[in-house]
C-alpha cells in the first residue's frame, strides 16, 4: 500500500506560499483534509495514547516476571512490537496532517511505515509461537514439563522477530520519497518501477503469510485447543470461548481492511477510479491495522476485571494477575487452575 | 554525479514537428518532477510546463497548451519536448530542469537551440 | 502571473566592489531563487529559498529580502562573477523569472 498518486491537480487557483507547516497545508487547490484522513488522525491519536501508556505498562509488568514465567515472556515481546509501532505514530500523524508531505527524509521514509508491517508479522509469529505454546500444554503436558523453559521461550521469540525482520525487507527496500513540484510536496511510498508483477508478488506473500495461513492455523489450532479443554470441563464456560474468540479475532479484524485494499490495488490499473477510490482510504486502513497495537492492553485489562468481579486492584496489580499467571502442564489442570489462569491462557492469542 | 544531457540542436520549417529529448543520469529518475524551460534573446527564461516523471501526467504552462507536449521513456530515464507545427516564435534555446517540490530547478541539461525558419 | 522585475539590466563593477542586484515582484512570495548563466551554457542554480547558497557557490555571494523585495549581494566583486543573474519565484502559478541582470567586469 502507500502506493503513489498518479493524478495531478489543476493548478489555475494555485498560490501557494512555498512553505510547508503544519497551519499551512501545501495543497491550496485543497486546503481541507478529506474525511477518510481525519478519521484516521483521531485513530493514530487514540492508539499512540493508549498505545503507548498501555503497552509501557504491560513491559514494565512483564520485564519483573520474564525470567521465570514463560507467559510474561509472550507477553512482554507482543507488548514491545506494539510499543515500536506505535512511536512511529506521531510522525505518520504529521505526516497526514500536512497533507500527506513528508519532510522526514528517505531513511525516515524507509523504517516508520515499514514498522507497522514489522508489527504485524512480529505479532502473527509470535501469536503461532503462542499457539504452539497452548497446544503443547494440553497435548503434551509431560514433554512440556521436560522440555518447556524461558531458555526455549526466548529462543522461539527470537527467531519469530528475525523472520519478521526478513519478511518486512520488501517493504522497506521498495519505500521512497519522491518530490512533487506542483502542489510542493514530498511523498513517501512504495515505488515497484510500475512492475505490477512485483508489486503483486508483494501483496500476495503479505497476505498469505501475514493473514489467511496464520488464520487458518490459529482457527484449527484453537479449535482442537477448545474442544479438549470442553471435554475435560464439567461446566463448559462461554465466556472462555467468548475471551478466546475476541483475542483471536482482533488481530484478524484489524487487519482485514489493509489486506484487503492492499491485494485489490496490486490487481487494479492505478488510472481506475476503484483505485483511486482505494488509495483515498489509504491511511484509514493503516490506522485501522494500527489499532492492533493498543488492543491488547485494552483486552488484558476488560478480561481481568471481568475475571475479578469490579475494579478493586491497582492496573499494575491486575495486569500481573492476567499475564503472569504460570501454566500448570499437567493435562487434566492445564485449563481448570483458575478463572484468572484461563484468562492468561487465552489471552496471549491476541 | 547528476547529468541531463538534452539532445543536439534541431533545423526546422514551419509547421513541421520536432522532439527533444532530455536524458537524465545520477539520480532516482521517478523522485524529481521534470520541467522545461524556454530561452529567447528577447524574452528571457520562461517556464513551460513539469511532467510528474513518476506518473507521466504533464502539466503545461497557459502559454504553452496545445502545440506543446511532454512525454516520459521512464525505462530510458528519459523525458521528452514535442512541438508540433512549428512557428518561427519556436525558435529558442530549449531546457530541461529538474524540479524541486521547494521551487527551484537544481539541475538543468545543457539545451537544444531549435531554428524555425523557411 | 508574478512579474519579476530585476535592477539593474546590465552593470559594471570593478574588482572587490561589493554588488547588489535587486529583484521586484508584482505580488508577494515567500522564497526566492537565484541563478548564474554565462554565455553559451545553461543557467546554475546559484541561491535557493532566499539565502541558502547553492552547492560550489563562493561564500562572498548572499541573499536575503522578502514579500516583493528580493536581493542578491556579491560581498567582493571577481572576474569569474560576471555573468547574467535571473531570480525566479514558485509561490504563485505559473514559476516565473526575472528578466535577468547581466553582470560585467570593469
Known amino acids: 500500500m502507500d502506493s503513489f498518486n498518479y493524478t495531478t491537480p489543476d493548478y489555475g487557483h494555485y498560490d501557494d506560499k512555498d512553505t510547508l507547516d503544519l497551519n499551512t497545508p501545501v495543497d491550496k487547490t485543497s486546503n481541507t483534509l478529506r474525511v477518510p484522513d481525519i478519521l484516521a488522525l483521531v485513530i493514530f491519536a487514540v492508539v499512540f495514547l493508549v498505545g503507548v501508556l498501555g503497552n509501557a505498562l504491560v513491559v514494565w509488568v512483564t520485564a519483573f516476571e520474564a525470567k521465570r514465567t514463560i507467559n510474561a515472556i509472550w507477553f512482554l515481546n507482543l507488548a514491545v512490537a506494539d510499543f515500536l509501532s506505535c512511536l512511529a505514530l506521531p510522525i505518520l500523524f504529521t505526516s497526514i496532517v500536512q497533507h500527506h508531505h513528508w519532510p522526514f527524509g528517505g531513511a525516515a521514509c524507509s523504517i516508520l511505515p515499514s514498522l507497522i508491517l514489522l508489527n504485524m508479522y512480529a505479532s502473527i509469529l509470535l501469536l503461532a509461537t503462542i499457539s504452539a505454546d497452548r497446544f503443547l500444554l494440553v497435548f503434551k503436558p509431560i514433554w512440556c514439563q521436560n522440555f518447556r523453559g524461558a531458555g526455549l521461550a526466548w529462543i522461539a521469540c527470537a527467531v519469530a522477530w528475525g523472520l519478521a525482520l526478513l519478511l518486512t525487507i520488501p517493504s522497506f527496500l521498495y519505500r521512497v520519497v519522491r518530490e512533487e513540484y506542483f502542489p510542493p510536496k514530498v511523498l513517501c511510498g512504495v515505488d515497484y518501477s510500475h512492475d505490477k508483477r512485483r508489486e503483486r508478488a508483494v501483496a500476495i506473500v503479505r497476505l498469505v503469510l501475514g493473514f489467511l495461513w496464520p488464520l487458518l492455523t490459529l482457527t484449527i489450532c484453537y479449535t482442537f485447543i477448545l474442544l479438549r479443554t470442553w471435554s475435560r470441563r464439567a461446566t463448559r464456560s462461554t465466556k472462555t470461548l467468548k475471551v478466546v474468540v475476541a483475542v483471536v479475532a482482533s488481530f484478524f479484524i484489524f487487519w482485514l481492511p489493509y489486506q484487503v485494499t492492499g491485494i485489490m490495488m496490486s490487481f487494479l490499473e492505478p488510472s481506475s477510479p476503484t483505485f483511486l477510490l482505494l488509495k483515498k482510504l489509504d491511511s484509514l486502513c493503516v490506522s485501522f491495522a494500527y489499532i492492533n497495537c493498543c488492543i491488547n492492553p485494552i483486552i488484558y485489562v476488560v478480561a481481568g476485571q471481568g475475571f475479578q468481579g469490579r475494579l478493586r486492584k491497582s492496573l499494575p496489580s491486575l495486569l500481573r494477575n492476567v499475564l503472569t499467571e504460570e501454566s500448570v502442564v499437567r493435562e487434566s489442570k492445564s485449563f481448570t487452575r483458575s478463572t484468572v489462569d484461563t484468562m492468561a491462557q487465552k489471552t496471549q492469542a491476541v | 554525479q547528476i547529468q541531463l544531457v538534452q539532445s543536439g540542436p534541431e533545423l526546422k520549417k514551419p509547421g513541421e514537428t520536432v522532439k527533444i529529448s532530455c536524458k537524465a543520469s545520477?539520480?532516482?529518475?521517478?523522485?524529481?518532477?521534470m520541467s522545461w524551460v524556454k530561452q529567447t534573446p528577447g524574452k528571457g527564461l520562461k517556464w513551460m510546463g513539469w511532467?510528474?516523471?513518476?506518473?507521466?501526467?504533464?502539466a503545461n504552462a497557459d502559454d504553452f497548451k496545445g502545440r506543446f507536449a511532454f512525454s516520459l521513456e521512464t525505462s530510458a530515464s528519459t523525458a521528452y519536448l514535442q512541438i508540433n507545427n512549428l512557428k518561427n516564435e519556436d525558435t529558442a534555446t530549449y531546457f530541461c530542469a529538474r524540479s524541486r517540490y521547494d521551487g527551484y530547478f537544481d539541475y538543468w541539461g545543457q539545451g537544444t537551440t531549435l531554428t524555425v525558419s523557411s | 502571473e508574478n512579474v519579476l522585475t530585476q535592477s539593474p539590466a546590465i552593470m559594471s563593477a570593478s574588482p572587490g566592489e561589493k554588488v547588489t542586484i535587486t529583484c521586484s515582484a508584482s505580488?508577494?512570495?515567500?522564497?526566492m531563487h537565484w541563478f548564474q548563466q554565462k554565455p553559451g551554457t545553461s543557467p546554475k542554480l546559484w541561491i535557493y529559498s532566499t539565502s541558502n547558497l547553492a552547492s560550489g557557490v563562493p561564500t562572498r555571494f548572499s541573499g536575503s529580502g522578502s514579500g516583493t523585495s528580493y536581493s542578491l549581494t556579491i560581498s567582493r566583486m571577481e572576474a569569474e562573477d560576471a555573468a547574467t543573474y535571473y531570480c525566479?519565484?514558485?509561490?504563485?502559478?505559473?514559476?516565473?523569472f526575472g528578466g535577468g541582470a547581466k553582470l560585467e567586469i570593469k
Open positions: 505580488s508577494s512570495v515567500s522564497y
Open positions: 525566479q519565484q514558485r509561490s504563485s502559478y505559473p514559476p516565473t
Open positions: 511532467i510528474n516523471t513518476y506518473s507521466g501526467v504533464p
Open positions: 545520477g539520480y532516482t529518475f521517478t523522485a524529481y518532477g
